[in-house]
Interface confidence: low
Amino acid sequence: KESCDVQLYIKRQSEHSILAGDPFELECPVKYCANRPHVTWCKLNGTTCVKLEDRQTSWKEEKNISFFILHFEPVLPNDNGSYRCSANFQSNLIESHSTTLYVTDVKSASERPSKDEMASRPWLLYR
């Protein structure tokens, strides 16, 4: 029998390489049985995750899964970083794994660093 606990399906180590200036939708896949949980997005800052309260979000409902979407309109260079969605369900807080946005500034897209470079030399992200 399928569990009726809320499930957040962001996979460990998931990542997106995106360009500054483009629109982007960051999806948090959510499964629930009856009442849709309250879901929020936060951005990791060191050991804390700062809640994104003033950002545009929306729900996209599908037949077997729903998506809580964080909208970037457009993506900005400082949107680079790791994000997590969280759901409040029956007084429990359920947290997703983090997903990382690698933002390349359009101005330097022609000299875009490789993922290996970005991992080992993160300052390249802010050129």
């Epitope: 569990s3 399906y9 997106h16 999806e27 896949p29 499964k31 599908e62």
Partner: antibody, heavy 120, light 108 residues
Framework: QVQLQESGPGLVKPSETLSLTCTVS????????WSWIRQPPGKGLEWIGY???????NYNPSLKSRVTISVDTSKNQFSLKLSSVTAADTAVYYC??????????????WGQGTLVTVSS | EIVMTQSPATLSLSPGERATLSCRAS???????LSWYQQRPGQAPRLLIY???TRATGIPARFSGSGSGTDFTLTISSLQPEDFAVYYC?????????FGGGTKVEIK
């Protein structure tokens, strides 16, 4: 009953781009994640990447620099492109549907697979 | 990435015997994220077990899964002729999703 069918050339020259399409019938491509998985002759399975119908993708880091997965919802198809192929890319390529159980991700429907040989 | 190692590589058994297949992960994997597949010659893999122990739709009760942490087991209680095939474990605890190298169950 959901069915998946891979199509594309069975022979690709070294350094060229391998292109395959998976056609989904018996169900909509919407609301699910879809994957490509390959199997070199006589060897095990290797996950290539997945795509959601909205276009969200994730790729295996070992192939990421050469892989593009795209989706065409109007045709109920998703596609794989693998660039700069070598003999090591010779394999049976499978497309598969990702099912989101409450416990995690598995592949519940598979295509029959198509053998792609890289040779000049 | 998480490396999945299956043993033995080949298991030679007779119909009616019990088969025990092992899958070991290079790091701890939550039991929620471990699946098993069967692949018969010339066919695509078929999902048998997900979440370590839950049988997929239409899978006979003679197939069972167990384990936790880094060690997982697929058991076939009484081998039927159609069970002689290659079996793969797969983890989705971390990306990239990875499969074991497979265990071939052959007729003795």
């Amino acid at each position: 009953q959901v069915q998946l069918q891979e199509s594309g050339p069975g022979l690709v020259k070294p350094s060229e781009t391998l292109s395959l399409t998976c056609t989904v019938s018996g169900g909509s491509i919407s609301s699910y994640y879809w994957s490509w998985i390959r199997q070199p002759p006589g060897k095990g399975l290797e996950w290539i990447g997945y795509i959601y119908y909205s276009g969200t993708t994730n790729y295996n880091p070992s192939l990421k620099s050469r892989v593009t997965i795209s989706v065409d919802t109007s045709k109920n198809q998703f596609s794989l492109k693998l660039s700069s192929v070598t003999a090591a890319d010779t394999a049976v390529y499978y497309c598969a549907r990702v099912v989101l159980y409450s416990t995690g991700w598995s592949f519940d429907y598979w295509g029959q697979g198509t053998l792609v040989t890289v040779s000049s | 990435e998480i490396v999945m190692t299956q043993s033995p590589a080949t298991l030679s058994l007779s119909p009616g015997e019990r088969a025990t297949l092992s899958c070991r992960a290079s790091q701890s994997v939550s039991s929620s994220y471990l699946s098993w597949y069967q692949q018969r010659p010339g066919q695509a893999p078929r999902l048998l077990i997900y979440g370590t122990s839950t049988r997929a739709t239409g899978i006979p009760a003679r197939f069972s899964g167990s384990g936790s942490g880094t060690d997982f087991t697929l058991t076939i209680s009484s081998l039927q002729p159609e069970d002689f095939a290659v079996y793969y474990c797969q983890q989705d605890y971390n990306l990239p999703l990875t499969f074991g190298g497979g265990t071939k169950v052959e007729i003795k």
